[in-house]
């Protein structure tokens, strides 16, 4: 039969510039001599010869003189290959081919890696920064392999996925330099962190920059928003109220107004230097231009969707700046529940029935309550599931298993906890007349 050749299942990971051992072994029979051994290492894809041992002699490296066997260990079945000063170009699959009387082969993968340098951060512009300014932060990390994954986050660790452009360029050695650019609208102050991850080494290199914009000696702008969340029905328009107190002689040319998502800092809408810069949020936002001069910085959000739910920051900068966050709570009423009964015929007292209560397209998740005809809660055998559709609206299905009495009414109440809206349905079951003894 064939000779069994063993190699590691997992790729061998080697750092650029270091030496790597590609393990390969076989089981020599008693009385085995090296004169009988033919050992060939080759590149799996191209069949290019890497190293060989034949007729009792090491035939040497055919691979840039950077390979070696372990001659003292060959007789014990160790056919491993030492690859020196690993390069990116070495990455790939190597086949270890052993022939004595029979032959066998197996392939081992070499995964090359190089750690990325600690990122350097540059900020443009880097002086005279004001709230509302757009800045470009560049994060550069060098000489890594393979291509990096780059993540940006703010000082609270919230991912910044918005305006990011990442480019990776390989040098002559195949090592990558990564440059990632984040464009962000400045708030009152902020820390921006860049993390460069080597996916093979699971090595993270990170740096951060903290930006504190210039403040005016004349003091901050007071920005007012409602304390309670604004509740908006899906598909309707919502107004996120925000106001400031303009000073005498205030002109809109001095105003920087920015609405952004509080967590991700994604720009929603802006007004700068006397002009409405328009919606950066799916063209569904608008200001109240005629009211801005009076200090009304409110935002109109049209055709509200579930995905809009969350916190929006209203950021006002005149000479100085102020900001406040307003929460949008999205809601959608649940439909009147439909009730189904299984089985639904030939019912007898003592039968177990399944009653399903279904209500559709509500938000947020519902609370479901079951009760009998006397209003007594039924908490026993109830299973409720809620599934969101593509729009994020929930369909709720609640199943009650109950043993029939003589007759009974079963009510299901679906409550929207935000709208405090109750939708209910009920079913009345009248069993067959009872006979004694009950028929089997």
């Amino acid at each position: 039969g064939a000779l069994e050749v063993q190699v590691p299942e997992d790729p061998v990971v080697a750092l650029v510039g270091t030496d790597a051992t590609l393990c390969c072994s076989f089981s020599p029979e008693p009385g085995f001599s090296l004169a009988q051994l033919n050992l060939i290492w080759q590149l799996t894809d191209t069949k290019q010869l890497v190293h060989s041992f034949a007729e009792g002699q090491d035939q040497g490296s055919a691979y840039a003189n950077r390979t070696a066997l372990f001659p003292d260990l060959l007789a014990q079945g160790n056919a491993s290959l030492r690859l020196q000063r690993v390069r990116v170009a070495d990455e790939g699959s190597f086949t270890c081919f052993v022939s004595i009387r029979d032959f066998g082969s197996a392939a081992v993968s070499l995964q090359v890696a190089a750690p990325y340098s600690k990122p350097s951060m540059t900020l443009e512009p880097n002086k005279d920064l004001r709230p509302g300014d757009t800045v470009t932060i560049t994060c550069s990390s060098y000489q890594g392999y393979p291509e990096a994954e780059v993540f940006w986050q703010d000082g609270q660790g919230v991912p910044l996925t918005g305006n990011v452009t990442t480019s990776q360029m390989a040098n002559e050695q195949g090592l990558f330099d990564v440059h990632s650019i984040l464009r962000v609208v400045l708030g009152a102050n902020g820390t921006y962190s860049c993390l460069v991850r080597n996916p093979v080494l699971q090595q993270d290199a990170h740096s951060s920059v903290t930006i504190t914009p210039q403040r005016s000696p004349t003091g901050a702008v007071e920005v007012q928003v409602p304390e309670d969340p604004v509740v908006a029905l899906v598909g309707t328009d919502a107004t996120l109220r925000c106001s400031f107190s303009p000073e005498p002689g205030f002109s809109l040319a001095q105003l920087n107004l920015i609405w952004q998502l509080t967590d991700t800092k994604q720009l929603v809408h802006s007004f700068t230097e006397g002009r409405d810069q328009g919606s950066a949020y799916a063209n569904r936002t608008a200001l109240f231009p005629d009211l801005l001069a009076q200090g009304n910085a409110s935002l109109r959000l049209q055709r509200v969707r579930v995905a809009d739910e969350g916190s929006f920051t209203c950021f006002v900068s005149i000479r100085d700046f102020g900001s406040a966050a307003v929460s949008l709570q999205v809601a959608a009423p649940y439909s009147k529940p439909s009730m189904t009964l299984e089985p639904n015929k030939d019912l007898r007292p003592g039968d177990t029935v399944t009653i399903t209560c279904s209500s559709y397209r509500g938000y947020p998740e519902a609370e479901v309550f079951w009760q009998d005809g006397q209003g007594v809660p039924l908490t026993g055998n109830v299973t409720t599931s809620q599934m969101a559709n593509e729009q994020g609206l929930f369909d709720v299905h609640s199943v009650l298993r109950v043993v029939l009495g003589a007759n009974g009414t079963y009510s299901c109440l679906v409550r929207n906890p935000v709208l405090q809206q109750d939708a209910h349905g009920s079913v009345t079951i009248t069993g067959q007349p009872m006979t004694f003894p009950p028929e089997a």
Epitope: P125, V135, T136, R183, G274
Partner: antibody, heavy 116, light 107 residues
């Protein structure tokens, strides 16, 4: 090293147009607004307008809104200022300068002479 | 538009003199004022921004002060390389506007 290199001097007839270029290097072109400022012989400085290279958003001085057009070519990091319907009083040195509030780097200037 | 009035329009001074140039604005611009120096045949060069912040590489003999509507550029001890024209510029509003300039000449 930050550099703004402008195109060469131009001589134009009244009623014609001129297009001046400003090639930026040594910084991220899309990170800074590019301003255009002119200076008539022996006179002060007059702001024409500015453009944000990232998305080509522009702001103009009302005095130039109808005649000046600011554009950029991001692929070559070059900003352009075109002035149409030229008259003799448009004879000036035209500068590009980067920044929003502070103009920290300026081009070397392009002399535009309008003469019949 | 915000009007910028610079005074004097020219002055003569000697090396080592203390020189003061004033700039007045038609409305309150808080502290958003910059000063530029221009030599004949050259582009303007930023000296001071935010009324009193010295640009990198600018000698400390240049000093800016003021806020609101009245601003001053002071050169504590005039050097030969300081003979030039100086402009103020407001960055509070669009359009950006410049003062008419002050030419500092050798006495």
């Amino acid at each position: 090293e930050v550099q703004l290199v402008q195109s060469g001097a131009e001589v134009k007839k009244p009623g014609s147009s001129v297009k001046v270029s400003c090639k930026a290097s040594g910084y991220t072109f899309t990170a800074y607004w590019m301003n255009w400022v002119r200076q008539a012989p022996g006179q002060g400085l007059e702001w024409i307008g500015r453009i944000e290279p990232y998305d080509s958003e522009t702001r103009y001085n009302q005095n130039f809104r109808d005649r000046a057009t600011l554009t950029v070519d991001k692929s070559t990091s070059t900003a352009y200022m075109e002035l149409s319907s030229l008259r003799s009083e448009d004879t000036a040195v035209y500068y590009c300068a980067r920044g929003v509030r502070i103009f920290d780097y300026w081009g070397q200037g392009t002399t535009v002479t309008v003469s019949s | 538009d915000i009007q910028m009035t610079q005074s004097p329009s020219s002055l003569s001074a000697s090396v080592g003199d203390r020189v003061t140039i004033r700039c007045r604005t038609s409305e309150n611009i808080d502290y958003t004022l910059a000063w530029y120096q221009q030599k004949p045949g050259k582009s303007p060069k930023l000296l001071i921004y935010n009324a009193n912040t010295l640009e990198e590489g600018v000698p400390s003999r240049f000093r800016g002060s003021g806020s609101g509507t009245d601003f001053t550029l002071t050169i504590s001890s005039l050097q030969p390389e300081d003979f030039a024209t100086y402009f103020c510029k407001q960055a509070y509003d669009v359009p950006r506007t410049f003062g008419g300039g002050t030419k500092v000449e050798i006495k």
